[in-house]
Interface confidence: medium
């Protein structure tokens, strides 16, 4: 009757852990927003499982997600962005688990890009700059950035600097001379929107000058 018997009874399915997490990305493709959800247990059998979002939508009551391998995804202009939406995991018409979520509190920004480091010899410092697509956005404009850098040989010894601008100055005397450094940056919503860290930008690698023995400064 249900049409799902060949894949196990619904009663069996209810024993599984269908907990999931989601993140939203606003104006990720022009004026389109996206919402991505995935099960927290990677071993969940997702056959016949669907995700649906209802409420806090413009023009429609509910929207169905598309499935892309193990993630579920919506791209739409129809998020109201005020009020909570109900996101449910469904088998047919039966909801297995639901969460009420305000999409403005689960925003994951796009990763920063164009990270670069320029050494200023006269100032004895390094100017770190990067770009973010959010400067041009209508909604998620205000971000906090996390710049992380390490000496390449120090696998897990990252130094983090939080900033709201897209430019940072690193003093030469704070870095080891004649060393290769890796630097990367990520962003998180600040101000009205809340959410998660973006993916890291691609890493940028730079070398510090050697110490000039006569002056005690780096070359």
């Amino acid at each position: 009757e249900s049409g799902y018997a060949q894949n196990g009874d619904l009663e069996d399915a209810e024993l599984d852990d269908y907990s999931f997490s989601c993140y939203s990305q606003l104006e990720v493709n022009g004026s389109q927003h996206s919402l991505t959800c995935a099960f927290e247990d990677p071993d969940v059998n997702t056959t016949n499982l669907e995700f649906e979002i209802c409420g806090a939508l413009v023009e429609v009551k509910c929207l169905n997600f598309r499935k892309l391998q193990e993630i579920y995804f919506i791209e739409t202009k129809k998020f109201l962005l005020i009020g909570k939406s109900n996101i449910c995991v469904k088998v047919g018409e039966k909801s297995l688990t639901c969460k009420k979520i305000d999409l403005t509190t689960i925003v994951k920004p796009e990763a920063p890009f164009d990270l670069s480091v320029i050494y200023r010899e006269g100032a004895n410092d390094f100017v770190v700059t990067f770009n973010t697509s959010h400067l041009q956005k209508k909604y998620v404009k205000v971000l906090m950035h996390d710049v992380a850098y390490r000496q390449e040989k120090d696998e897990n010894k990252w130094t983090h600097v939080n900033l709201s601008s897209t430019k940072l100055t690193l003093l030469q005397r704070k870095l080891q001379p004649a060393a290769m450094y890796e630097i990367k940056v990520r962003s998180i919503p600040d101000h009205y929107f809340k959410g998660f860290w973006s993916e890291w930008s691609p890493s940028y690698y730079f070398r510090t000058p050697e110490i000039n023995n006569s002056s005690g400064e780096m070359d």
Partner: antibody
Framework: EVQLVESGGGLVQPGRSLRLSCAAS????????MHWVRQAPGKGLEWVSG????????GYADSVKGRFTIFRDNAKNSLYLQMNSLRAEDTALYYC??????????????WGQGTTVTVSS | AIQLTQSPSSLSASVGDRVTITCRAS??????AAWYQQKPGKAPKLLIY???SLESGVPSRFSGSGSGTDFTLTISSLQPEDFATYYC???????????FGQGTRLEIK
Amino acid sequence: EVQLVESGGGLVQPGRSLRLSCAASGFTFDDHAMHWVRQAPGKGLEWVSGISWNSRGIGYADSVKGRFTIFRDNAKNSLYLQMNSLRAEDTALYYCAKDEYSRGYYVLDVWGQGTTVTVSS
Amino acid sequence: AIQLTQSPSSLSASVGDRVTITCRASQGISSAAAWYQQKPGKAPKLLIYDASSLESGVPSRFSGSGSGTDFTLTISSLQPEDFATYYCQQFNSYPLWITFGQGTRLEIK
């Protein structure tokens, strides 16, 4: 039963302040945006202000911006409107209204009976 | 802010008549329109949302249509309890604000 009860209205002199309250019951208050709408005697409806469920989304009509402040206390299921620098043109019946976002967007599906504010010297 | 203009501002009709009220937005608002009914001394009551969806408990003689800039409320056969003032409404989500039309007063002829 879903219910909204406004209070705090009264007669006040121009330039003075007044705080309106709205007590909500019968629904999960912190799931919903809330609004204040007013109606001057013999006139139409005018939206005054709205606030999202978590107080992070707030809006005001141009006519009250900088003078009125909307806020809410989800623990007390209450909505408030702090009205400062009142003017004669603020005289109206003030309604509290619940926003039913599951209808698709800002839809005011439950209204209180209103509280009257009269600004006069 | 978007302006909403209702027409007519008032109209007289008889029981059993078919009545149409229009609401024009100064710019396109998709299908984001709602209609309310208000009787003297009472709070407004939601009739139609999403331009054409009927609120539960509202008689089926009420219907809504339209999109973009032009929206219509139709009462197919007027009943005595329908004589009231009707308002259209629209919204903007960011920044948050709501706009009402100026109202249409429906009177008994």
